[in-house]
């Protein structure tokens, strides 16, 4: 028997520095978690103690904090190299700055293989990107070899900006021939490493013949055996065992997100490469694990540029950006309109000639808008200003909801109107009319939504049974502010870009902004 230790991360999303327990900015260092310096300490400890160790990342290192905004992926290559990752799969967010934003900072600088079997380059890009990512890589580990085959969510064209010269194939269809190729090379221990979410991970384990282990990402799935060490609630045991169609027991793992945990899986193989046993658990990277001093020093060196960046002008406003709770929790506010417009703009993807865009709607809880921006400071808007408006370090995500769920969400928006509560929704691509004289749960009298399957966008009445795409804060997707119906009834949820980054990019693009209050939210006569 031969034993392999798989250490794995996924959806780190730019959390290079340690964070608070909820993965936002670290405030009290004695209670902070994660970060690459702490991760390195634990990885090194395991490498010294155990013989056959692989450190793998299942994608979405890109996007999530000011680190990515400023360094654009160079920080990912640098610190992943420093941690000596053995392989990485491409995630959807690796394409957020286009293909060039992946090639130059990461693919050309990474000293480890970057993998995806289901992304095929065509046209002029094919030769440019040749060799910079691979479908699979065979890694010598001790006296054995292990094949790692990569995969990426085929939804990436809807979630990011991969351009027109990359084709995202079905994961299972693309993986099988690559696994077969590895088998012909006499590689009998194969790990599928990828970024398509837990449901697809399980399908791969079930359907792809020859895959021994699946290491996944994208769905931020937390698996744990025993009593979980922090706030995350396990979606199942670690590893999650799937019985493949050919009768094998295939362990599937994922390690939550944001570098809070280091996945730790021990696999025992027999001489024919069959998995005899698998066990482990994610390791919580809390303050009991010291930060490695040399990596920490490097982090501090790279930090300097971030501090300078946050005070630089991104663009100008020529109007007052009303982000006050007195406005945003009671009525349409122009800060809400600005943020929603930025959210839609960030999701412009012309992937189908029938649609001007794949998504037209935005909802945003008024309580998530934490500050106004005064235009009387020469109109200047900085990252620092935006961090006061959006201080929680959230993301703007893409969900699919039925019209009936959206109707419930808008009823919830005003179910206790007048108490300055955070659930009052700001919108984009939606016209809503409330009648507050009616009883809670029956106050939405008109709800029109902007069409997507149209050449000239116009507002049509919401259809209860239709499925709509909506951009919203991850806070709402997770049922925050009482929006349990969104969490319970959403049909799909893909995590998006950092909230501040979305707004800052939009302001930089527009250069000068002047959002208005324009009748997106109305109250019917006599009730307000």
């Amino acid at each position: 028997a031969w034993e392999l230790t798989i250490l794995h991360t996924n959806d780190v999303h730019s959390r290079l520095e340690q964070t608070s327990e909820d993965s936002s900015k670290c405030v009290n260092a004695s209670r902070c978690m994660g970060g690459v310096a702490r991760l390195f300490t634990k990885v090194q400890q395991i490498r010294r103690a155990e013989p056959n160790v692989l450190l793998l990342d299942a994608g979405d290192q890109y996007q999530g904090t000011i680190w990515f905004t400023v360094y654009k992926g160079a920080e990912v290559a640098h610190f992943m190299n420093a941690l000596r990752y053995d392989a990485m799969a491409l995630g959807n967010h690796e394409f957020d700055n286009g293909v060039e934003g992946l090639i130059e900072p990461l693919l050309k600088e990474a000293k480890f293989p970057i993998l995806s079997a289901n992304i095929k380059a065509k046209g002029p890009l094919a030769s440019q990107i040749s060799g910079l990512y691979l479908p699979y890589k065979v890694l010598p580990v001790g006296d054995e070899v292990v094949g790692i085959v990569g995969y990426t969510s085929k939804e990436t064209p809807f979630l990011s900006n991969p351009g027109t010269n990359l084709v995202f194939e079905d994961e299972i269809t693309a993986l099988q021939p690559e696994v077969d190729k590895l088998k012909t090379l006499n590689v009998n221990k194969i790990i599928a490493l990828g970024h398509s979410g837990f449901e697809m991970d399980k399908l791969i384990a079930q359907k792809v013949r020859g895959v021994d282990v699946v290491v996944g990402g994208h769905s931020n799935t937390f698996l744990y055996t025993g009593n979980p060490p922090s706030k995350e609630v396990p979606a199942g045991k670690y590893p999650f065992i799937v019985t493949s169609d050919d009768g094998r027991k295939v362990p599937v793992v994922q390690a939550y997100a944001f570098g809070k945990y280091l996945g730790y899986l021990k696999i025992e193989f027999d001489e024919r490469g069959n998995v005899i046993s698998s066990h482990g658990n994610p390791i919580l990277l809390n303050s009991s694990i010291p930060e490695d001093p040399s990596i920490k020093a490097d982090i501090n060196k790279w930090r300097i540029k971030l501090d300078n960046y946050s005070t630089q002008e991104l663009g100008k406003t020529i109007v007052y950006l009303d982000g006050s709770s007195q406005s945003c929790r009671f009525r349409e506010c122009n800060m809400g309109n600005l943020i929603c417009d930025a959210m839609i703009n960030n999701n412009l993807r012309h992937t189908d000639e029938m649609f001007w865009n794949h998504v037209s709607m935005c909802i945003l809880n008024g309580g998530g808008i934490r500050s106004p921006i005064d235009e009387r400071n020469n109109g200047t808007i900085t990252w620092e200003n935006l961090a006061a408006v959006l201080p929680f370090g959230g993301t703007f995500d893409l969900v699919q909801l039925k019209g009936s769920t959206l109707k419930k969400a808008f009823e919830h928006s005003v179910h206790r109107y007048g108490q300055s509560t955070g659930e009052f929704l700001q919108v984009g691509g939606i016209h809503v009319v409330y009648d507050l004289s009616r009883k809670p749960g029956d106050r939405v009298v008109k709800l029109d939504v902007l069409c997507t399957k149209c050449r000239v966008p116009s507002y049509d009445p919401l259809k209860m049974d239709e499925v709509y795409k909506v951009i919203l804060p991850n806070f709402l997707a997770n049922g925050g502010d009482g929006f349990q119906m969104i969490k319970d009834e959403l049909l799909r949820h893909d995590s998006g870009d950092q909230d501040i980054n979305v707004v800052s990019t939009y302001i930089s693009k527009m250069k000068v902004i002047y959002p208005a209050v324009e009748g997106r939210i109305k109250f019917s006569t006599g009730s307000h």
Partner: antibody, heavy 122, light 110 residues
Amino acid sequence: EVQLVESGGGLVQPGRSLRLSCAASGFTFDDYAMHWVRQAPGKGLEWVSGISWNSGSIGYADSVKGRFTISRDNAKNSLYLQMNSLRAEDTALYYCVRSGSYNYYYYGMDVWGQGTTVTVSR
Amino acid sequence: QSVLTQPPSASGTPGQRVTISCSGSSSNIGSNTVNWYQQLPGTAPKLLIYSNNQRPSGVPDRFSGSKSGTSASLAISGLQSEDEADYYCAAWDDSLNGWVFGGGTKLTVL
């Protein structure tokens, strides 16, 4: 300036041993995997052995497996090749080579020393 | 006998474009990236191309690499007399678990 300087070559009888050393300077040694590559007189290049940044992963060409041992001392910025049971066909110029990565099986070889000559003869 | 196959020699006149081929199998070039090395007479080899088509800094853009299937090629345009050297391709081999080189191509500038 990045430099690799090999030493330890010489004339040795078949069946005997020799230890080659390579002193590295001008870069952070433990950031890189290292290799030994040889070139027989008038012939092409042949990879001999590779070692990852922390000695955690090591590989050998079939022609030297079981006879040669690669090692490194990161504290001394040094790479070594212990050659036992030497044969006439081991006669070659031995290059110390830096990998472009910290794993010897990825990225290729980006910096080469000038080589040290090993002659195996009676 | 080298694992990767290169023509033993190639030639061209100054200013011309020459191409050197390198043929392998599914376990080396077919699965991994290709590197090219230049060895000027009496000197150590030097990295010319890595990851199929990437040039290290300092290598003129007259040198370019490409890969297709289990073969790779090195193209040198605007040939100069100082390009006279031996050229070697190399790739990691997943079956042999080691680096393999081509036998080398001696380029003569006429």
